[in-house]
Structure formats: structure tokens, C-alpha cells
């Protein structure tokens, strides 16, 4: 049976390999039944997740799911790290899995590593 609880469907252990200077949209898939919940993004700093207050966000609606999007325009080197979205629903806080951005700084990278390289050898990003 379909639950009417809010669900945040960021993939577990997900990663995105992106270039500094490019635009990027980080999506938080949100499933809800009636009223759209209030959703926020935060960036992990150790064990705490620091709320991203002044960042551009938007909603995108699809047939069975909605997306709360965090916009990077453009991606900066210090956007590297792990992010999480969370929703307030009936006075409960629901947190997503974290998703990790691996940012390559084009100025310092002589050549762009492949997706497979970046997934298996993230230290390449810090050469």
C-alpha cells in the first residue's frame, strides 16, 4: 500500500561529479499526498548539517513526484561536499540520505577525470 507520509528519495550513497564554473541543479525528489511540505537543503559539516539559507531553490513538478532543486550558478570549488534535504511534515522532520558533490576545479585540473575515475578515485579531485 502507498504511504501518505512525505518521502524524500535522494539515492543512498549517491555522488555527482561536476565541473567548477558549470551550472548544476541538485534535485531532492519529494513524494507527498496533499499539501506540499516545506523543504530545505543543508550542507554537511562533520556531523552537523548547516542550513543553506540564501541559495536559489525552485520546485519542479512531475506526474508522480516533485523535485526541490538547489541551483548552483555556477558551481564553485568550495561547493564540494555532501548535501541533504529535509522536510517538515505534520511537525515531524524527515531527512534524506546525503548526496556528495565532487567538484573538479578546471583551473587546477590539467585534464578532466572520467566519471568512473572520479567515482572510484575521488582523491583525483584534490591533486
Amino acid at each position: 500500500k502507498e504511504s501518505c507520509d512525505v518521502q524524500l528519495y535522494i539515492k543512498r550513497q549517491s555522488e555527482h561529479s561536476i565541473l567548477a564554473g558549470d551550472p548544476f541543479e541538485l534535485e531532492c525528489p519529494v513524494k507527498y499526498c496533499a499539501n506540499r511540505p516545506h523543504v530545505t537543503w543543508c550542507k554537511l559539516n562533520g556531523t552537523t548539517c548547516v542550513k543553506l539559507e540564501d541559495r536559489q531553490t525552485s520546485w519542479k513538478e512531475e506526474k508522480n513526484i516533485s523535485f526541490f532543486i538547489l541551483h548552483f550558478e555556477p558551481v564553485l570549488p568550495n561547493d564540494n561536499g555532501s548535501y541533504r534535504c529535509s522536510a517538515n511534515f505534520q511537525s515531524n522532520l524527515i531527512e534524506s540520505h546525503s548526496t556528495t558533490l565532487y567538484v573538479t576545479d578546471v583551473k587546477s585540473a590539467s585534464e578532466r577525470p572520467s566519471k568512473d575515475e572520479m567515482a572510484s578515485r575521488p582523491w583525483l579531485l584534490y591533486r
Epitope: Q7, Y9, K11, R12, Q13, S14, E15, P29, I65, A119
Partner: antibody, heavy 119, light 112 residues
């Protein structure tokens, strides 16, 4: 309902490559992971790796890194596994597995594809 | 890699009797998100595997409630309260906490 339909059986010679396909339906392919698991005759299950169809990001068991390549085509909702430099030990049934919204919990299994490597 | 060790590797059970399979991992499967990514799969002869239990103890829909899962950290158990003829096959534990994900070697269940 979720369905994973895999390509037909393959017979290959040692040193050759094989490319297997897995067509998904009944769910949003981009919102999940596609995993590949294999099973040699009379043996146990072995996880090969997984791909995120939304961005092509892959994770492999180091045992298969460099010889296995997973790709995904979101236009056709199809995941692919290519295995190169085949040897007799690669004879196995290869399963495509999907999970619910990227939970990495191996929810749904395809019917499997038998790959036979023989000279 | 995390090694998953199942015992016994085979068991023969009389219908209506209970059965128990143990699975031990070489390190704790408790993830940083507070969940333990330990599943049990059943593979009947000639069929694809199917998931019975996920996150240690959650029963998949359509799975009879005679199946149950328990455990924490490194020690996990699959129990069948009353074995039936349709339960024959091989049972695998699996961990999804650490890459690479790994399976136990399997336990073959036969009916006496």
C-alpha cells in the same frame, strides 16, 4: 508493476567481450540504481557493481574494475553490462537488479542471462 | 571487503519444524544513518533470487510471516517458524552498508 527484461543467452570465446542489456519498465528508471549480480553454475551470488542512470555514476567491486563497464540509456530505460577479456570463470548467469528509489536494497530482479565462455 | 559468513551451509528440516540460519559479518553493518543494511534472499531451484527481508527485520510484501529476521551489529539470524515444502532453495544474506556489497556463501534448505 516493476519489470526487468534481460537479453538472451550468449556463448563467447575466451578473450572476447559480451554486452548484456536489461530493459526496465513500471517505474522511473532515473530515480533508482541498476545493479548487476552474477552466479556461476552451482555457486553463490556475487555483486559486480551498480550504476546511477541519472548521471552515469558507477561503483564496481574492485575485482571487476577495468574489465566490467556499466552504462545506462535513460531514453530507452535500459541498463547495460559489458564484460571484456572473458575467461571460462566468467561463465555464469548475470542478473540485473533494481531498487526502490535508490535505496540500494536490491528489490527487483531480472530473469538473468546465461553467459557461457568456452573455446 | 566485508566478509559474510553463513552457518550452516545446508540443513534438512521436517515440514512443520522450525529452521534457523546464522549470518555473521566481519564488521558492524550499522551505517552512519542509523540503519543496518542487511537483507535475506531466497533462491528457489531454477529461479532468480527474491528478497525476503530487508533492513534486518522488515518483511517484504507477499512473504509469509513464518519468516522473520533479527540481529544487530555483526550477528544476524533468519528464522522460519514452520518449514513448508515451498521453502526449499538456497538462502543468502547480503550487506549493503559498505562497498563493495557482499553476499554470504548461501545456505541450502532441504525437506526431510
Amino acid at each position: 508493476q516493476v519489470q526487468l527484461v534481460q537479453s538472451g543467452a550468449e556463448v563467447k570465446k575466451p578473450g572476447a567481450s559480451v554486452k548484456l542489456s536489461c530493459k526496465a519498465s513500471g517505474y522511473n528508471f532515473k530515480h533508482t540504481y541498476a545493479h548487476w549480480v552474477r552466479q556461476a553454475p552451482g555457486q553463490g551470488l556475487e555483486w559486480i557493481g551498480r550504476i546511477d542512470p541519472a548521471n552515469g555514476n558507477t561503483k564496481y567491486d574492485p575485482k571487476f574494475q577495468g574489465r566490467a563497464t556499466m552504462t545506462a540509456d535513460t531514453a530507452s530505460n535500459t541498463a547495460y553490462l559489458e564484460l571484456s577479456s572473458l575467461r571460462s570463470e566468467d561463465t555464469a548467469v548475470y542478473y540485473c537488479v533494481a531498487d526502490h528509489y535508490g535505496s540500494s536494497l536490491l528489490d527487483y530482479w531480472g530473469q538473468g542471462t546465461l553467459v557461457t565462455v568456452s573455446s | 571487503d566485508v566478509v559474510m559468513t553463513q552457518t550452516p551451509l545446508s540443513l534438512s528440516v521436517t515440514p512443520g519444524q522450525p529452521a534457523s540460519i546464522s549470518c555473521k559479518s566481519s564488521q558492524s553493518l550499522l551505517d552512519s544513518d542509523g540503519k543496518t543494511y542487511l537483507n535475506w534472499f531466497q533462491q528457489r531451484p531454477g529461479q532468480s533470487p527474491r528478497r525476503l527481508i530487508y533492513l534486518v527485520s522488515k518483511l517484504d510484501s507477499g512473504v509469509p510471516d513464518r519468516f522473520s529476521g533479527s540481529g544487530s551489529g555483526t550477528d544476524f539470524t533468519l528464522k522460519i517458524s514452520r518449514v513448508e515444502a515451498e521453502d526449499v532453495g538456497v538462502y543468502y544474506c547480503w550487506q549493503g552498508t559498505y562497498f563493495p556489497y557482499t553476499f554470504g556463501q548461501g545456505t541450502k534448505l532441504e525437506i526431510k
